[in-house]
């Protein structure tokens, strides 16, 4: 369940913390999984463990694996696992994919780029920085702590930026690299043709009769404010209100803005006390804006006795 | 399939002892806690103890502390809830539950279906 | 012994609603915090472990997170089957306690 990811090069120092959480006073015992075989907590040793933290400095090749961390806490012992892979330094300047950490968007107002893992490094500022292996220079470029901020960021901005620090270690020095792409975000804001994220075109829900259901009918019109974005349901071809059952209501439109910065909106229908009848309406969830109108049906249908009782 | 199975309803009258027990399966029942909470009609959920079926090593609530016995027999794979003198605010639902291994742990991830305790005169 | 003191003590919310359940520790217990759900007449259930991670078989609807003492459990969309008591419970130290629940019903 508690495994986590690690990688480094050979040669430089990698530290890597338990997946499993636990207060700094607890102690954590560190083991080779293959071999069961305790790290020792010695600091003259190359690999050692130093509670929540396994270091290898320097790192070697013959390291990769998989090793096995257990927190004593005064309750219950916890086990987590960090698979460990240590790479070849690569020759040219190429950064292979499994070398990257996670990708971070920014634009023209933010920026930041943090450098992966440094958190778990004894370093001193100022860190350097690369691009695509060229050293950043110019007055664009600020390092601040423990990340890169770029002012007027353009889209020719995107790219792999690698952080440089040193790591030490009583006195000795270890070299870390790490890299991750930067990619760069417009934040205009556009239209589009609405697109329904639910319910799906021409899907069926089951319902119990006497029981309520709800039909939520959510559309996406594009990014930022829209001029005319509208979500609506029909019966029958029917608009709600031309359609005399105080059973079944449609709630006011709700806008919604997704990660993804999408506008949408949601409208719920409600149906209270669930007839036979319902089932032999079509409902329409209608999205409509200036490029036009999608419109996509969903049908009701008796819950199954057999599937309920299971 | 992992499941805890618990002994059935139970009434006593006060002053009688009574031992209940929850039987383990689908998985090594010696290598994982197994512990006891109680609820009392219309309340919230009290942790009472622990046992480790293969040292027998046990933990208490100190609520519960010298109120009741923790066992188990491993070669059946059944653990026990029991009391000497039963009284009636005794009256409660217990259930077990598995509390992870010597070497893991993930919250109480398997529980009994629970025993109904009725302790009235 | 680590009290822990959940809140609101019942809630009422509609169909589709976020719902947000805290729980708060008398110590700091780092992360070792759990949420169960206990359906009327029946055993709980184990949800979430180590304040955040999502049991087997649990829908993604349901999270947590926190560390310390202050700790969050949310429901994003509520759903009809949702109906229950919600406990937290602590682990870092014996004896281990819950919180006194939250019954949370359908409007």
């Known amino acids: 369940k508690f495994s986590k990811q690690s990688w480094g090069l050979e040669n430089e120092a990698l530290i890597v913390r338990c997946p499993r959480q636990g207060k700094s006073s607890y102690i954590v015992d560190w083991y080779y999984s293959q071999t069961n075989k305790s790290i020792p907590t010695q600091e003259r040793n190359r690999v050692f463990a130093s509670g929540q933290l396994l270091k290898f400095l320097p790192a070697e090749v013959a390291d990769s694996g998989i090793y096995t961390c257990i927190v004593r806490s005064p309750t219950f012992n916890r086990t987590g696992y960090a698979n460990v892979t240590i790479y070849k330094k690569q020759p040219d300047c190429n950064v292979p994919d499994y070398l990257m950490y996670s990708t971070v968007s920014g634009s023209e107002k933010n920026s930041k780029i943090y450098c992966p893992t440094i958190d778990l490094y004894n370093w001193t500022a100022p860190l350097e920085w690369f691009k695509n292996c060229q050293a950043l220079q110019g007055s664009r470029y600020k390092a601040h702590k423990s990340f890169l901020v770029i002012d007027n960021v353009m889209t020719d901005d995107a790219g792999d930026y690698t952080c440089k620090f040193i790591h030490n270690e009583n006195g000795a020095n270890y070299s870390v690299t790490a890299t991750r792409s930067f990619t760069v975000k417009d934040e205009q804001g556009f239209s589009r043709f609405p697109v329904i994220r639910a319910p799906a075109h021409n899907e069926t829900k089951e319902v119990e009769i006497g029981e309520n259901t709800n039909l939520t009918c959510s559309a996406c019109f594009g990014k930022g404010a829209q001029f005319l974005a509208a979500v609506q349901w029909q019966l029958n071809g029917n608009k709600i209100t031309d359609f005399s059952e105080p059973r079944i209501q449609q709630e006011e439109g709700q806008n919604q803005s997704f990660s993804d910065g999408l506008a949408c909106v949601n409208t719920v229908l409600r149906i209270a006390d669930v007839k036979e009848e319902d089932l032999l309406l079509r409902y329409d969830c209608l999205a409509l804006n200036l490029h036009g109108l999608r419109r996509h049906t969903i049908r009701l249908s008796r819950k199954n006795p057999i599937d309920h009782q299971s | 399939e992992v499941q805890l199975v618990q002994s059935g309803a139970e009434v006593k009258k006060p002053g009688e002892s009574l031992k209940i027990s929850c039987k383990g399966s689908g998985y090594s029942f010696t290598n994982y806690w197994i512990g006891w909470v109680r609820q009392m009609p219309g309340k919230g959920l009290e942790w009472m103890g622990i046992?480790?079926?293969?040292?027998?090593?046990?933990r208490f609530s100190p609520s519960f502390q010298g109120q009741v016995t923790i066992s188990a027999d491993k070669s059946i794979t059944t653990a026990y809830l029991q009391w000497s003198s039963l009284k009636a605010s005794d009256t409660a639902m217990y259930y077990c539950?598995?509390?992870?291994?010597?070497?893991?742990?993930?919250?109480?991830?398997?529980w009994g279906q629970g025993t109904t305790v009725t302790v009235s005169s | 012994d680590i009290q822990m003191t959940q809140s609101p003590s019942s809630l009422s919310a509609s169909v589709g609603d976020r719902v947000t359940i805290t729980c708060q520790a008398s110590?700091?217990?780092?992360?070792?915090l759990n949420w169960y759900q206990q359906k009327p007449g029946k055993a709980p259930k184990l949800l979430i472990y180590?304040?955040?991670n999502l049991e087997t078989g649990v829908p993604s609807r349901f999270s947590g997170s926190g560390s310390g003492t202050d700790f969050t459990f949310t429901i994003s969309s509520l759903q009809p089957e949702d109906i229950a008591t919600y406990y937290c419970?602590?682990?870092?130290?014996?004896?281990?306690?819950f919180g006194g629940g939250t019954k949370v019903e359908i409007k």
């Open positions: 180590d304040a955040s």
């Open positions: 419970q602590q682990d870092d130290n014996f004896p281990l306690t």
């Open positions: 046992i480790y079926p293969g040292n027998s090593d046990t």
């Open positions: 539950a598995r509390h992870g291994t010597s070497s893991d742990y993930y919250g109480l991830d398997v």
């Open positions: 110590q700091d217990i780092s992360n070792y």
